[in-house]
């Protein structure tokens, strides 16, 4: 999916609003220097496609992320926000609404979440130059 | 089976506002995104905006914004679109629809439309 | 905003007879388009999403084809329930645009 045409501020603003606060309860008790963030971005659009793909797709040692409330409020945003976006998600499971008990969350996983958080504070600052 | 029902006609006078209901019954509410689409007599579809219930989050068309505002009541499972200083040219049925994936904005399913008429 | 343009603005046609209505997109909307049917006095009803996916319960004779800019939806052999207006809708863009509509009456 292409995100050229997201509206992007309105984005930012369910970031900084809820999506943000999410994503710190998940890592709670977790030290802010525990994890090197290793992926990056480049610009908005880039930012979140990388977001999409941490959030939704699973990797090894952390099968999903999907059912998280951080996953199920940036999944709305986007579908409200990227026109066309949730049509792109159709084969996706419509089983990660039925919320089951929180498994136990790896340190793959915590891991994951932070360099998301990275991503994010990247896609907050479009206009910084890359590291 | 998903329905939408929605509030009766409306003849409303121009500079006034109208607020149209559309209560969602068979199955879940909040994560399936609302959109508003009017037709005005005789001629084509036109969207209005949407929201996702789940969050309150609400797209509006550039050329409703700051005259409509759509919003979702959980717990009666209704949302509601209202558009203020209205003008004749706003006379027109006015549908909600839904989609029938999470926070989609396809639209699946429709409401019966309701008649706006404004006229002094 | 994008336009969407459909051709013809009518068409008549008789039953068994094969229709092709076609819809322009001002500018790349990729397959985000879909179509909608709508009967007088009627809300819209959904038959393709995705430029050429058939929704769920919408009779096999409608088709969609195309990507980019140029589209069609193709009834291979009209029904009399199939007279009614159409409508295309591009998807790839804010705020969400339709065509004007083609009507499709009986000869």
């Known amino acids: 999916y292409d995100f050229t045409n997201c509206d992007f501020e309105k984005i930012k603003a369910a970031y900084l609003s809820t999506i943000s606060k999410d994503l710190i309860t998940y890592m709670s008790g977790t030290k802010s220097t525990e994890f090197n963030n290793t992926v990056s971005c480049s610009n908005r659009p880039h930012c979140l496609t990388e977001i999409q793909s941490l959030t939704f797709n699973p990797t090894a040692g952390c099968a999903s992320l999907a059912k998280e409330m951080f996953a199920m409020k940036t999944k709305a945003a986007l579908a409200i926000w990227c026109p066309g976006y949730s049509e792109t998600q159709i084969n996706a499971t419509q089983a990660m609404k039925k919320r089951r008990k929180r498994k136990v969350t790896t340190n793959k996983c915590l891991e994951q979440v932070s360099q998301l958080q990275g991503l994010w504070r990247r896609f907050n600052r479009p206009l910084l130059k890359q590291q | 089976q998903v329905q939408l029902v929605q509030s009766g006609a409306e003849v409303k006078k121009p500079g006034s506002s109208v607020k149209v209901s559309c209560k969602a019954s068979g199955g879940t509410f909040s994560s399936y995104a609302i959109s508003w689409v009017r037709q005005a007599p005789g001629q084509g579809l036109e969207w209005m905006g949407g929201?996702?219930?789940?969050?309150?989050?609400?797209n509006y068309a550039q050329k409703f914004q700051g005259r409509v505002t759509i919003t979702a009541d959980e717990s009666t499972s209704t949302a509601y679109m209202e558009l203020s200083s209205l003008r004749s040219e706003d006379t027109a049925v006015y549908y909600c629809?839904?989609?029938?994936?999470?926070?989609?904005?396809?639209?699946?399913?429709w409401g019966q439309g309701t008649l706006v008429t404004v006229s002094s | 905003d994008i336009q969407m343009t459909q051709s013809p603005s009518s068409l008549s046609a008789s039953v068994g007879d094969r229709v092709t209505i076609t819809c322009r997109a001002s500018q790349d909307i990729y397959n985000y388009l879909n179509w909608y049917q709508q009967k007088p006095g009627k809300a819209p009803k959904l038959l393709i999403y995705?430029?050429?996916s058939l929704q769920s319960g919408v009779p096999s004779r409608f088709s969609g084809s195309g990507s980019g800019t140029d589209f069609t939806l193709t009834i291979s052999s009209l029904q009399p329930e199939d007279f009614a207006v159409y409508y295309c809708q591009q998807q790839n863009d804010y705020p969400l645009t339709f065509g004007q509509g083609t009507k499709v009456e009986i000869k």
């Open positions: 929201i996702i219930p789940d969050f309150g989050w609400a």
């Open positions: 629809a839904r989609s029938g994936m999470f926070y989609s904005i396809l639209f699946d399913y």
């Open positions: 995705g430029a050429s």
